[in-house]
Interface confidence: low
């Protein structure tokens, strides 16, 4: 049995983490010569038959899951992987600290702690310079992010966000940056270990010229990679609740 039309890719430029009132472009990319694209916001009736959606100003109502597909002749492709568009700056920023401190010897241990005055049950940690966003919801269940056996790769600038599993696409503003310094080794900033590299798409003003307005309300963001966490009290093996979209 041969497969169907391959699924397109859907990306947010410059990132899928979008501060409120900032712009973002969603782009669906299929093979050359596609007859028709369909880009939709899941769990809603919003859709457009265009490959590109330019959002000049991000709103709460536009946060959520998006996906796209394309049509060639009478055939529809499989749907793209779903894109989670997150509105940031919805809540006040949390604080990020390092225990025992932000300077750590190579081979030592450090724990990054994200704290908020609100009753949020989800947290996301980002390392500046890494592609965004990366989530590993099954690895962490609390607002502490232990880094065991620190290496030079862990050096860099970190930020965290807090949010609620009830509204998983509405996040706080980012914390103030925390600079993690690894001593006793040559420092070569890189991605957090165990996370696969992925390309970072660059935003171009030319993108806007290709776009079509999707709605009057509309979505940029920080480029980085994240790890999400929920509090230690959570026993769910699924990690942070992912209120489906639909990926």
């Amino acid at each position: 049995q041969s497969g169907p039309l391959p699924k397109p890719s859907l990306q947010a430029l410059p990132s899928s983490l979008v501060p409120l009132e900032k712009p973002v472009t969603l782009r669906c990319q299929g093979p050359p010569g596609v007859d028709l694209y369909r880009l939709e916001k899941l769990s809603s009736s919003r859709y457009q038959d265009q490959a590109v959606l330019f959002i000049p100003a991000m709103k709460r109502s536009l946060a959520g899951r998006y996906r796209c597909s394309y049509q060639n002749g009478s055939l529809w492709s499989l749907p793209s992987d779903q894109l989670e568009l997150v509105a940031t700056g919805v809540f006040a920023k949390p604080s990020l600290s390092a225990q025992p401190g932000p300077a750590v010897s190579s081979g030592g241990d450090v724990t990054l702690q994200c704290q908020t005055r609100y009753g949020f049950d989800q947290f996301a940690l980002y390392k500046e310079g890494d592609p965004a966003p990366y989530k590993n919801p099954e690895r962490w269940y609390r607002a502490s992010f232990p880094i065991i056996t620190v290496t030079a790769a862990h050096s860099g600038t970190y930020r965290c966000y807090s949010f609620s599993s009830r509204d998983p696409y509405l996040w706080s503003a980012p914390s103030d940056p925390l600079e993690l310094v690894v001593t006793g080794t040559s420092v070569t900033p890189s991605r957090l270990p165990t996370e696969p590299p992925s390309p970072v798409a660059e935003f171009s003003e030319a993108t806007a010229e290709l776009t079509v307005s999707f709605t009057n309300e509309v979505f940029t963001t920080e480029t980085s990679r994240s790890i999400t966490a929920s509090p230690k009290e959570s026993d769910s093996p699924a990690g942070p609740a992912r209120q489906y979209y639909t990926k």
Epitope: Q1, G3, P4, K7, E40, L42, S43, S45, Y47, S69, W76, L78, P79, D81, Q82, E84, Y134, K135, N136, P137, E138, P196, A238, G239, R242, Y244, Y245, T246, K247
Partner: antibody
Framework: QVQLQESGPGLVAPSQSLSITCTVS????????VNWVRQPPSRGLEWLGM???????DYQSTLKSRLSISKDNSKSQVFLKMNSLTTDDTARYYC????????WGQGTSVTVSS | DIQMTQSPSSLSASVGGRVTITCKAS??????IAWYQHKPGKGPSLLIH???TLQPGVPSRFSGSGSGRDYSFSISNLQPEDIATYYC????????FGGGTKLEIK
């Protein structure tokens, strides 16, 4: 050629945990998601959950509290773990590629019994 | 969660005949429905996705239609090898299978 192959324990005691591995070939887990589906004896298909290319997961709401799906991209393997098994979990378990599940494995039979 | 009500649960038809199976969703699924054929001892096979898009290699006597909450799947010129259980699947919001339809040949 796209292929998926499930491997499991066959027999599991009640209240114990179930672990099943889906080994795939012909496509990359970095880009494609994998679903888990089961079929109890003489009953229909039931979707359990999915792990996406980026590692994020979704679960059937009634099973979310005792289900965990993970993967190892480098080994082309996806893992299903289900806790607190009862005899109602006796079924044939399948893994299937992405949405809307265009390729399936042959399934592995799991019996929950003491 | 979205519920899918599939009917009938079983049906019998003659070779060369035509059968139709329906699935009703508990809410609008925006054409995100697929149909599968499942034979004993095998994994299910995808026949149709996105309501009416036929998988490559699937005979054109299989077809699908519908919109909103109501969808149907038909087999024309029924063949002996079509004996199987057929399932609908919605993939608009999480995934939910219909209860299945067991097809027998008279």
């Amino acid at each position: 050629q796209v292929q998926l192959q499930e491997s499991g324990p066959g027999l599991v005691a009640p209240s114990q945990s179930l672990s099943i591995t889906c080994t795939v070939s012909g496509f990359s887990l970095t880009y494609y998601g994998v679903n888990w589906v089961r079929q109890p004896p003489s009953r229909g298909l039931e979707w359990l959950g999915m792990i996406w290319g980026d590692g994020s997961t979704d679960y059937q709401s009634t099973l979310k509290s005792r289900l965990s799906i993970s993967k190892d991209n480098s080994k082309s393997q996806v893992f299903l773990k289900m806790n607190s098994l009862t005899t109602d979990d006796t079924a044939r378990y399948y893994c299937a590629r992405d949405l809307p599940m265009d390729y399936w494995g042959q399934g592995t039979s799991v019996t929950v019994s003491s | 969660d979205i519920q899918m009500t599939q009917s009938p649960s079983s049906l019998s038809a003659s070779v060369g005949g035509r059968v139709t199976i329906t699935c009703k969703a508990s809410q609008d699924i925006n054409k995100y429905i697929a149909w599968y054929q499942h034979k004993p001892g095998k994994g299910p096979s995808l026949l149709i996705h996105y309501t009416s898009t036929l998988q490559p290699g699937v005979p054109s006597r299989f077809s699908g239609s519908g919109s909103g909450r109501d969808y149907s799947f038909s087999i024309s010129n029924l063949q002996p090898e079509d004996i199987a259980t057929y399932y609908c699947l919605q993939y608009a919001l999480l995934l939910t299978f219909g209860g299945g339809t067991k097809l027998e040949i008279k």
